[in-house]
Structure formats: structure tokens, C-alpha cells
Interface confidence: medium
């Protein structure tokens, strides 16, 4: 089920997953320039069983100039090369959460991949939070967010955590700061108030995909 | 990549209300991208409107626009929407779609300065006269 709704903002925060639950997809994105071949995935998909997961699909981009030649890279779910782009890396990672079962590592890049990736989550996903340079971390509880079902929605967790425009590193995610009212409401797990502002209810299911997601074809 | 086009810019009186469309398509999920207007005046900056999240749960505004203009997104068709209430004249210029593609490492739900978007429609023009 995919999580249709945004994980919770937190002022002066990013937040990252460190790995992706089986049913993620990753868009076949490719660099100005470049195009997904008409034969090519739309996205790449995380698959797997109880022991092993993986990317399934492989992403391909050739030039716009061009028609015959592709460029593609194979993804190894056991690969973990850098991505040089301008995100932020994280100092450290909370947990090797690509070890556990049912989550894939963050696929290796292809040729000409644009240089941000977009993700659609599913339910189960947890992503970790870390306050922007110039700001301090102050929380008391873990700063994550997970994509739960609830009554038939799904939501996001809220996650303990401010950060403070002092100019001072935060470690991330675990460091322990003095105790702070976190920004938003705490989360019932039992209550069952949700308005239609909360959780927007989506079309766009995996299901119907290649009918109502994906519109025009590149030429 | 996605393309998007605007429409429903024109002339009102000051007091009045315009709904602006911006369109977008391509071979994409629509829901991957966060949206915003921004608008230009003749001989200003391209300043920020308001944005929404991917999912619509999200927005931010302008000072100079709260309370009276509201964005929204429809992403079974997509598109997303400008309501403009109680206009200004000072409210008249260019109005810009733009988009940003979420990103799988660290980003915000939600930008507000027009560096981080990456895709721009052509603009539609809104005329509020006294």
C-alpha cells in the first residue's frame, strides 16, 4: 500500500530513509539531455522474499539527440557506490537498515540519472530526521517518522524533534539533547479523529498505473 | 520531467477573485513533484506565492498573500490551483507554475524560494485594476 501522504514537516529539518521497503518505487528519472528509452522501466520497483530484496527493473537513459544508443547500469541490491550529488549526507546511519528483511539499499546510480531521485513510499516505511546546518537537535524520543495504516488511512508518525537556530553540528539522529516540547501534536495510536485535510484520499494506486499515472510517452 | 502550463490569468477589479490552473504533463507520476506559484511584476524579482506538498498536505504562503490566496492540487488530474480572493492591485503580474522533483535523500515537503524548482511554466498574466 503506497503511503499517500507526506511524512510530517519539522521546521528547519530534512529527513532521509536509509532504506526502502519492499513495494518502494524509485522513478526512472534521467538528466536534461537525456530520456528513458520508449522500452524502458518507468520506475524500479523493490522486490524480494523473506530473505532477499532487491531492485527489479532497470532504468535507462539515452540521449535526446540520439535514438539507438542506451546507457544503463544493472542495479546490484548488494552494491553501495556513492552518489555524488549536492543532497546532504547524513554523518551516520542509525542502523544498517538495509540488513534487515523485506528492505532494499539505496540502488546504485544509472548513466545519466538526474540528479535527484523521487520515491513513493509504502506503508512501513520509516525515514530519520536531522535538523538543517546552523540548527541543533532537540528531542525526546527517536527522530523518525513511520508510514502506519490506521482505520483504513494511512499517516505518518510524528516525530520528537525540534531544532534550534543555534549555530552548533546536530549528530544525527541519535543524539541525546535536553528535553524539549516536540513541534506538532503527540500521535494516538488509539484515536480514530481524521478530517479529510489530514489524509488525502489518492488515485493513483499501483494498480492502475499504466492507465492513470503515466500520461504522454516521450517522443 | 514534466511540462506545465497555466491558464485562467485576465483582468479583475480590486475586491474580486480569479482561479488560476497550472497543468502539468509528462511521462511521470504527478505526485512526485511539489508545486508552488510565483508571481513577477513588471521591472521586480520572481518572488514566491505558495507552494503545496506532493500529496497536498503541506502549503506555505507569502506574507503579502495569506488569507486571501489559497493553493490546492488535484492530482488525479494534475493540476494545481491558485484561488485569489479579495485582490489587490498590487497583486497584478506574471503568474509562474513551477515544480520540484522530491528528492530520496534529505529534503523539505515544502520550498519556497524559486532556485529549488526545477521546472517552470510559461506564466499567465493577472490584471487587478482599482
Known amino acids: 500500500e503506497l503511503c499517500d501522504d507526506d511524512p510530517p514537516e519539522i521546521p528547519h529539518a530534512t529527513f532521509k530513509a536509509m532504506a526502502y521497503k519492499e513495494g518502494t518505487m524509485l522513478n526512472c528519472e534521467c538528466k536534461r539531455g537525456f530520456r528513458r528509452i520508449k522500452s524502458g522501466s518507468l520506475y524500479m520497483l523493490c522486490t524480494g522474499n523473506s530473505s532477499h530484496s532487491s531492485w527489479d527493473n532497470q532504468c535507462q537513459c539515452t540521449s535526446s539527440a540520439t535514438r539507438n544508443t542506451t546507457k544503463q547500469v544493472t542495479p546490484q541490491p548488494e552494491e553501495q557506490k556513492e552518489r555524488k550529488t549536492t543532497e546532504m549526507q547524513s554523518p551516520m546511519q542509525p542502523v544498517d537498515q538495509a540488513s534487515l528483511p523485506g528492505h532494499c539499499r539505496e540502488p546504485p546510480p544509472w548513466e545519466n540519472e538526474a540528479t535527484e531521485r523521487i520515491y513513493h513510499f509504502v506503508v512501513g516505511q520509516m525515514v530519520y530526521y536531522q535538523c538543517v546546518q546552523g540548527y541543533r537537535a532537540l528531542h525526546r524520543g527517536p527522530a523518525e517518522s513511520v508510514c502506519k495504516m490506521t482505520h483504513g488511512k494511512t499517516r505518518w508518525t510524528q516525530p520528537q524533534l525540534i531544532c534550534t537556530g543555534e549555530m552548533e553540528t546536530s549528530q544525527f539522529p541519535g543524539e541525546e539533547k535536553p528535553q524539549a516540547s516536540p513541534e506538532g501534536r503527540p500521535e494516538s495510536e488509539t484515536s480514530c479523529l481524521v478530517t479529510t485535510t489530514d489524509f488525502q484520499i489518492q488515485t493513483e494506486m499501483a494498480a492502475t498505473m499504466e492507465t492513470s499515472i503515466f500520461t504522454t510517452e516521450y517522443q | 520531467q514534466v511540462q506545465l502550463v497555466e491558464s485562467g490569468g485576465g483582468s479583475v477589479q480590486a475586491g474580486g477573485s480569479l482561479r488560476l490552473s497550472c497543468a502539468a504533463s509528462g511521462r511521470t507520476l504527478y505526485s512526485s513533484y511539489g508545486m508552488a506559484w510565483f508571481r513577477q511584476a513588471p521591472g521586480k524579482e520572481r518572488d514566491f506565492v505558495g507552494s503545496i506538498s506532493r500529496y497536498g498536505t503541506y502549503t506555505s504562503y507569502a506574507d503579502s498573500v495569506k488569507d486571501r490566496f489559497t493553493i490546492s492540487r488535484d492530482n488525479a488530474k494534475s493540476t494545481v490551483y491558485l484561488q485569489m480572493n479579495n485582490t489587490k492591485p498590487e497583486d497584478t503580474a506574471v503568474y509562474y507554475c513551477?515544480?520540484?522533483?522530491?528528492?530520496?535523500?534529505?529534503?523539505?515537503?515544502?520550498?519556497?524560494?524559486?532556485?529549488?524548482?526545477?521546472?517552470w511554466g510559461q506564466g499567465t498574466q493577472v490584471t487587478v485594476s482599482s
Open positions: 513551477a515544480a520540484y522533483t522530491y528528492s530520496g535523500s534529505f529534503y523539505s515537503a515544502v520550498k519556497t524560494h524559486r532556485d529549488e524548482y526545477q521546472y
